[in-house]
């Protein structure tokens, strides 16, 4: 498939099985877990990556205040249902027939229910706030250098068009990266901010999804930027629907 290497691997997704059985003997790569063909010239969707991960053997003040509707992924890993394009299906259920609705990044946005639960549409996550705390350094990073380096990272490594990196905020030791992408802004083939954020999250955790590349080596003017904590907030185009019981818990 596109950009699968001569040695038949997928540079943008190591959780694939590749073989030269595409048209004309071209290399074709399929995601583990789902068996879906993936485009190796771009990032693989988070849904297919989560599915692959679940199928893999188990091993060991200028700052933004997240809105009251911001979601954090507290539920952790699950084996998702993906549609034919690799996107999350709006309704997800587990093996015990417990169901819930998710947004476009696969984060639960309703209370859990049973099989009668309806999720009418996949609600788009249009604003992602990545909140990082870096390890102590001799001094604060220069804000404009940090801004430029993080924008370069999202453009070059995660293939995200620069206009989707809305802002980089910094108050030592907290860094916030704001990604924004409305439906009207996303061209066909554009990397989704949810997928870019997921690749970044895995990189930060030292679990790079890229094939054969070294892990993420983030440096600002030669000074290593080492992250010790990450929190990601997701804002949907339509606010989530949780019961008051959860909100007061």
């Amino acid at each position: 498939h596109t950009a699968a290497q001569d040695n038949c691997t997928c540079p943008t997704n190591k959780m694939t099985v590749c073989s030269p059985d595409g048209p004309g003997g071209r290399c074709q790569c399929r995601a583990l877990g789902s068996g879906m063909a993936v485009d190796c010239s771009t990032l693989t969707s988070k849904c297919l990556l989560l599915k692959a991960r679940m199928s893999a053997p188990k091993n060991a003040r200028t700052l933004v205040r997240p809105s009251e509707h911001a979601l954090v992924d507290n539920d952790g890993l699950y084996d998702p249902d993906c549609d034919p394009e690799g996107r999350f299906k709006a309704r997800q259920c587990n093996q015990t027939s417990v169901c819930w609705c998710v947004n476009s990044v696969g984060v639960r946005r309703t209370d859990k229910g049973d099989l009668s639960l309806r999720c009418d549409e996949l609600v788009r996550t249009h604003h992602i706030l990545i909140d990082l705390r870096h390890r102590p350094t001799a001094g604060a990073f220069n804000h404009s250098d940090l801004d430029a380096e993080l924008r370069r990272l999202f453009r070059e490594r995660y293939r995200l068009h620069p206009k989707f990196v809305a802002a980089v905020h910094y108050e030592q030791p907290t860094i916030q990266i704001e990604l924004r992408q409305n439906t009207s802004q996303k061209a066909a083939g554009d990397v989704d901010i949810g997928d870019a954020a997921y690749y970044f999250e895995r990189d930060i955790k030292g679990e790079s999804l890229f094939q054969g590349r070294g892990g993420l080596d983030l440096r600002v003017r030669g000074e290593p930027l080492q992250v010790e904590r990450t929190l990601i907030y997701y804002l949907d185009e339509i606010p989530p629907k949780f019961s008051m019981k959860r909100l007061t818990a």
Epitope: S41, E156, R180, A187
Partner: antibody, heavy 118, light 111 residues
């Protein structure tokens, strides 16, 4: 001096494909997104898509997703656009245009005229 | 897609007069980063479009200061003070806040 030199005019038959080129000079080719724009005779402009030469990432106008394929050759600082299954509606002038940091198309090629006729 | 509507379609002017072209978008062009990615181009007969103004009001290099852009949200204006013969042609507005689109064009011609 920034320059975008496009390939010459094309006369092609319906159903055929055409591949045009846009050679960049005067700037670091891999640092800028390259856009392609269609202008039908006496009409306005339509954005087709962009490509980022450094890694080949693309974005397309949904309307042209199945019509156009954008590629680059970094070694020659050249961007390419292939148009397939041509019909008379594809007869137009096609421009490549560099995108600046304000996301505006600041330098344009001279255009490649495509005429689809049997 | 975001629709860009330009008025007038044709603008006859006398040399030395001021010309004003309007561009209206079907959605706000304010980006999540606070900027507004609305641009103006001039296309002379037989030539490719040339960038005049980017992000509403910034003149591109080499563009004379008789060209000025203004506006916000969904309503934008290009003004040309003291029109010269070399200014004649078709003016297009364009937005890149959303998937890029162009206005239909305004033909500036001699009265």
């Amino acid at each position: 001096e920034v320059q975008l030199q496009q390939s010459g005019p094309e006369l092609v038959k319906p159903g055929a494909s055409v591949k045009m080129s846009c050679k960049a000079s005067g700037f670091t080719f891999t640092d800028y997104y390259m856009n392609w724009v269609k202008q039908s005779h006496g009409k306005s402009l339509e954005w087709i898509g962009y490509i980022y030469p450094n890694h080949g990432g693309t974005g397309y106008n949904q309307k042209f997703k199945d019509k156009a394929t954008l590629t680059v050759d970094k070694s020659s600082s050249t961007a390419y656009m292939e148009l397939r299954s041509l019909t008379s509606d594809d007869s137009a002038v096609y421009y490549c245009a560099r995108e600046n940091y304000g996301y505006a198309m600041d330098y344009w090629g001279q255009g490649t005229s495509v005429t689809v006729s049997s | 897609d975001v629709v860009m509507t330009q008025t007038p379609l044709s603008l006859p002017v006398s040399l030395g007069d001021q010309a004003s072209i309007s561009c209206r978008s079907s959605q706000s062009l304010v980006h999540g980063d606070g900027n507004t990615y609305l641009h103006w181009f001039l296309q002379k007969p037989g030539q490719s479009p040339k960038l005049l103004i980017y992000t509403v009001s910034n003149r591109f290099s080499g563009v004379p200061d008789r060209f000025s852009g203004s506006g916000s949200g969904t309503d934008f204006t290009l003004k040309i003070n003291r029109v010269e013969a070399e200014d004649l042609g078709i003016y297009f507005c364009s937005q890149t806040t959303h998937v890029p689109t162009f206005g239909g064009g305004t033909k500036l011609e001699i009265k």
